[in-house]
Interface confidence: low
Amino acid sequence: SGTTNTVAAYNLTWKSTNFKTILEWEPKPINQVYTVQISTKSGDWKSKCFYTADTECDLTDEIVKDVKQTYLARVFSYPAGHVESTGSTEEPPYENSPEFTPYLETNLGQPTIQSFEQVGTKVNVTVQDEWTLVRRNDTFLSLRDVFGKDLIYTLYYWKSSSSGKKTAKTNTNEFLIDVDKGENYCFSVQAVIPSRRTANRKSTDSPVECMGHEKGESRETGHHHHHH
């Protein structure tokens, strides 16, 4: 059964990065509005984005309650100007989303190199820890807090004067690498969850940062450019 002149939503798609999670769908509404419901496999449905003309709904607040749960959403279609009627027994058309498990499926956002510091022939490169909207005891958690050792960072580094890249990895947010004295190096990092096997295993590469520019500090030269 369906409600007159309404079309069921379709192409329900989860868009999620660092747990910021939005459900998108089609079509753009003509004379209809949507309401979204979300639940865990064993939980009750909770309604969100009531009677919206948008084709997206931010469900972050719901999924961050337990990022390891599996969620299902559904989008109901109502006639434009719909006012909930207690007398209506006809179920509006709706479409279910794919299942979504945030911990496994959220994309890793592009990381940022926070700073680098050279001491002799060693360089310490620090990756900025991104904050998420996941909370524990009313405190927002960082990406590292949520993923722990499941999250590693890969550092790509190369001499400014050459194209040969080297790599290092860490399961903290810091790298300590050996460099040749007197050479400038460039750096880029990538967030990785090795235990994932899907396309969302890796983030995009961070912007490239190079020694001799505004990001680092060198005890040899006395330049201090800390980025926060």
């Epitope: 390891k68 911990y103 050792k149 790599t167 990895k169 235990s195 096997r197």
Partner: antibody
Framework: QVQLQQWGAGLLKPSETLSLTCAVY????????WSWIRQPPGKGLEWIGE???????RYNPSLKSRVTISVDTSKNQFSLKLSSVTAADTAVYYC??????????????????WGKGTTVTVSS | EIVLTQSPGTLSLSPGERATLSCRAS???????LAWYQQKPGQAPRLLIY???SRANGIPDRFSGSGSGTDFTLTISRLEPEDFAVYYC?????????FGGGTKVEIK
Amino acid sequence: QVQLQQWGAGLLKPSETLSLTCAVYGGSLSGYYWSWIRQPPGKGLEWIGEIGASGSTRYNPSLKSRVTISVDTSKNQFSLKLSSVTAADTAVYYCARDTPYYYEGGYYYYMDVWGKGTTVTVSS
Amino acid sequence: EIVLTQSPGTLSLSPGERATLSCRASDSVDSSYLAWYQQKPGQAPRLLIYGAFSRANGIPDRFSGSGSGTDFTLTISRLEPEDFAVYYCQQAGVVPYTFGGGTKVEIK
């Protein structure tokens, strides 16, 4: 050192459900995949499926309709259920840890820790 | 499904000889996902090589892996008595993960 200890019924009748459990000692479920593999008598190895610590599963399509792999992180163990068994399911069943390993720009997956195997016979 | 075909099915050699085992894939396999295992009667398989060419912990350097794409090779440079066993290649990049049919290395 991580060890896998597995157990379950060894003799089943056709149409029954095979149920095996594998306990992980000396290590965590987290960060790995956990696989089941079987080997019919005198034959080669067949991958049945795997589960991640968070519950994500992948199954061999040839068995998918009959297989359920689950994980119990509180007990540090994972389990295999195979429904509607026939004589063709007679095999030694192994559990194994499937390790994702990063080294110098590459990701490698390999089964580095195995259980000793459980012989399962299906016979009327 | 990626089919892995191992050859020869049986290799009869003497201790001290060199063993060359082949694994051919029906479709290209990322070498990161290609592994070799050794299995002795009544025992579980044991990881020898991962990533097509990296030796697992505790594996002697007489074992080496090579190859890429659809053709991979396990070489045992000098067979020791304990090396006589069945060897399987495996790909873990595409579901279903598949094993080759095995090569039995037996004493001549």
